[in-house]
């Protein structure tokens, strides 16, 4: 059956032979209506990429550099299955390219000019492409030929396989630049030996190199890693201090109509029958015909790449930056230490308009990028299409798991001038009901619920976390009869109460009328029994403070709070009747952009912050008539975090624990991708 067939692309006679064997052996173990293999032979991996894009083949396994080529237009392929190494219990699908130095040296990443460097080999990922790609814009001009620029940047190097005649400085630390193990400084162990022997000041290797070469922790402690933010960390902290994370070997397919489920079904069955130590007659991860045919011989199995993970996310910002710099050879005109405009990520149409107004008033220091959901915005910040946005704590958690960092906190209670330097304790997550109802925390089952959005703190993580510990399952849509929780599955009962309009029904952005704090409260006013919001929501939308037709006649005394002990209290008493304390919303950014974002925002709030009194004829950063566009409308200022500069420290141990527990109920495709 053609639609059940996976056309595998082979790049040599030997691969084609193994592919045919793969096809025949799969036929013998799979049912006739199951997936099947067909083999397509091409001259090179690039030809395979083109063939898949043109729908002449379906799949091929590629190294990271080729995954980058596959992702570029017009190919537009995406990773669908990853090979893993190591054990099934601790599968490794990535390695980290690192810069190792001796602990007793005193320079940082931005002080490598004039040092001596040790590389694994010319054109190799961890040893050359990544470090030189990331340093590319610091190299002296002209940057072509690249080897000459590198030779003029470092004071001496060992770059195995380089041309020692044309570029003698590249072979200064290893005469002749031998391209095999005859050169004592060749490859990973060689580059590390070059550093260890004192020939070089820095070695560009894999994170595992130092562990493979120094079994003794005391010996390893004589070395450190250089981080991209110009700090150093211990060699154990490579996950937080590396030049790039590099995927090892990946199966790619078309982004649209790519048969990814079928490819996974095929490979999952293949590893069950013909994986490591499974069969004598055919082995997926070895071959009598040659090395690394179709798959790497060192692979132990396959893992399905999460569907939300596109090639940009899979390869990572640093890796793509390095490869793009090398391939395109373009550098910004401004020096790299100068802050470029900050690209703010705006959620759908309304936020985009406010962002545009901010952009005009900032004289272009702020630029705007849009996405339809918060998770899409986070992904854009991760891959460099955007730089920053302000997020609810639930999304600060997801952003943090995706490698972003908190930069500034929204403060709601501290008057100026102390605001900027004050760390507030947070706000209260509350459950609001109509005073006329007889609801309590203990009889919510079967009622109609209103939530700010799935994944947000007051509207979801806190109430659903508490509910989970009571009901011990994730079927919240069965607990409530119906509700509006923007971001839920469209056919879920938790989208039934949403107001839309139609194509935007239940979407987690302002196009859904019941989205956010104000939206969830409106849902309660018009349709629901309980709303999960922040403690300020009722006062901010009653007594004529919200002039919208639905809100202008509402009275604060018509609403009450549910307390966890089963009692109810006035909305004026959130300190004595709340579900939990929630961390304030915070601005997040990529680590490399954090300082620029902080500097610019502190400057912008001095001009457009809460000191502006007349928002009808001036731009106000923290005002959008109860819509909470870009920032919460009750923000007084953006405050420095001081030492609370990681998502764990910012959110606090208790909240991180609560959200981690709720992860078993997670519907976040982005979180799944970021924890892959």
């Amino acid at each position: 059956v053609p639609e059940k067939s996976v056309r595998w692309c082979a790049v040599s006679e030997h691969e084609a032979t193994k592919c045919q064997s793969f096809r025949d052996h799969m036929k013998s173990v799979l049912p006739s209506n199951g997936p099947s293999v067909a083999c397509v032979k091409k001259a090179s991996h690039l030809d395979c990429i083109r063939a898949i894009a043109a729908n002449e083949a379906d799949a091929v396994t590629l190294d990271a550099g080729l995954v980058y080529d596959a992702y570029l237009a017009p190919n537009n392929l995406k990773p669908v299955v990853a090979e893993f190494y190591g054990s099934k219990e601790d599968p490794q699908t990535f390695y980290y390219a690192v810069a190792v130095v001796k602990k007793d040296s005193d320079f940082q990443m931005n002080q490598l000019r004039g040092r001596k460097s040790c590389h694994t080999g010319l054109g190799r990922s961890a040893g050359w492409n990544i470090p030189i790609g990331l340093l590319y814009c610091d190299l002296p001009e002209p940057r072509k030929p690249l080897e000459k620029a590198v030779a003029n940047f470092f004071s001496g190097s060992c770059v195995p396989c380089a041309d020692g005649t044309d570029f003698p400085q590249l072979c200064q630390l290893c005469p002749g630049c031998g391209c095999s193990t005859l050169n004592q400084y060749f490859s990973y162990s060689g580059a590390f030996k070059c550093l260890k022997d004192g020939a070089g000041d820095v070695a560009f290797v894999k994170h595992s190199t130092i562990f493979e070469n120094l079994a003794n922790k005391a010996d390893r402690d004589q070395y450190e890693l250089l981080c991209l933010d110009n700090t150093r960390k211990s060699v154990d902290e490579y996950k937080d201090c590396h030049l790039a994370r590099v995927p090892s070997h990946t199966v790619v397919a078309r982004s649209v109509g790519g048969k990814e489920d079928l490819i996974w079904e095929l490979l999952n069955q293949a590893q069950e029958h013909f994986g490591k130590d499974k069969s004598k007659e055919f082995q997926l991860f070895s071959s009598p015909h040659g090395k690394d045919l179709l798959f790497k011989d060192s692979a132990h199995g396959f893992l399905k790449v999460p569907p939300r993970m596109d090639a940009k996310m899979y390869l990572g910002y640093e890796y793509i930056t390095a490869i793009r710099n090398l391939r395109e050879g373009t550098c910004p005109e401004a020096p790299t230490d100068e802050c470029k405009p900050v690209k703010w990520c705006a959620l759908s149409h309304h936020e985009r308009l406010k962002c545009d107004e901010w952009s005009v008033n900032s004289a272009g220091k702020i630029e705007c990028e849009s996405a339809e959901t918060t998770e899409d915005c986070i992904a854009k910040i991760m891959n460099g299409e955007a730089d920053a946005m302000s997020l609810d704590g639930g999304f600060v958690y997801i952003a943090g798991m995706c490698g972003l960092v908190p930069v500034l906190a929204e403060n709601y209670n501290t008057p100026n001038p102390n605001c900027e330097n004050t760390a507030e304790e947070g706000y209260f997550a509350v459950a609001v009901v109509k005073s006329s109802s007889d609801l309590t925390w203990d009889n919510l089952k079967g009622k109609k619920s209103c939530h700010t959005a799935v994944g947000r703190t007051a509207g979801w993580n806190i109430p659903m976390g508490l509910l989970y510990s009571k009901i011990n399952h994730c079927r919240f849509d069965e607990f409530f009869s119906e509700g509006c929780a923007p971001g839920s599955e469209k056919n879920s009962s938790l989208c039934k109460l949403c107001m839309g309009p139609s194509p935007n029904l239940c979407e987690p952005n302002n196009k859904e009328g019941y989205y956010g704090y104000t939206g969830a409260f409106r849902c309660l006013v018009e349709k629901g029994d309980v709303a999960f919001v922040k403690h300020q929501t009722v006062p901010q939308n009653t007594g004529g403070k919200n002039p919208d037709a639905w809100a202008k006649n509402l009275k604060e005394e018509d609403y009450e709070l549910l307390c966890l002990d089963g009692s109810r209290k006035s909305v004026q008493e959130p300190a004595n009747c709340h579900l939990a304390r929630a961390p304030n919303h915070a601005v997040v950014a990529r680590k490399d952009k954090a300082d620029c974002v902080q500097t610019l925002l502190l400057d912008q709030q001095r001009m457009f912050g809460s000191s502006v009194t007349d928002c009808s004829s001036n731009f106000c950063l923290f005002e959008s008539k109860t819509k909470d566009l870009l920032f919460r409308d009750d923000t007084v200022c953006l405050a420095k975090l001081h030492d609370r500069n990681t998502y764990e420290k910012y959110l606090g141990e208790e909240y991180v624990k609560a959200v981690t527990n709720l992860r078993k109920c997670s519907t976040s495709p982005l979180l799944e991708a970021c924890t892959f």
């Epitope: 149409h349 309304h350 936020e351 107004e357 001036n618 731009f619 008539k625 819509k627």
Partner: nanobody
Framework: EVQLVESGGGLVQPGGSLRLSCAAS????????MAWYRQAPGKGLELVAG???????NYRDSVKGRFTISRDNSKNTMYLQMNSLRAEDTAVYYC???????????WGQGTLVTVSS
């Protein structure tokens, strides 16, 4: 709320010029920021140029040096002078004010600019 009406569009050859006007039914003196947007066939709405109450301006990169935005508070009108027009400038052009703070979905009829030889 101020009502805005765009005019001045038309068919023009590449390299040609047009001046768009945006007339307000009420006073624009106190409006903090005004802007021109455009929407090309099958594309999303994009900010072309904006002007603050004090007259400072900002332009999208592709129109810098070719387009000039200005406002005349006494005539309650905003303008967009478009020079060196290119085929990719073909779009419906809308003016907006941000005064409502609702960042509304309400747009006028717009004025169509077609750049073609």
């Amino acid at each position: 709320e101020v009502q805005l009406v765009e005019s001045g569009g038309g068919l023009v050859q590449p390299g040609g010029s047009l001046r768009l006007s945006c007339a307000a039914s009420g006073s624009i003196f106190s409006i903090a920021t005004m802007a021109w947007y455009r929407q090309a066939p099958g594309k999303g709405l994009e900010l072309v140029a904006g002007i603050t109450r004090s007259g400072s301006t900002n332009y999208r990169d592709s129109v810098k040096g070719r387009f000039t935005i200005s406002r005349d508070n006494s005539k309650n009108t905003m303008y967009l002078q478009m020079n060196s027009l290119r085929a990719e400038d073909t779009a419906v052009y809308y003016c907006t004010d941000y005064s409502s703070r609702y960042y509304h979905d309400y747009w006028g009829q717009g004025t169509l600019v077609t750049v073609s030889s």
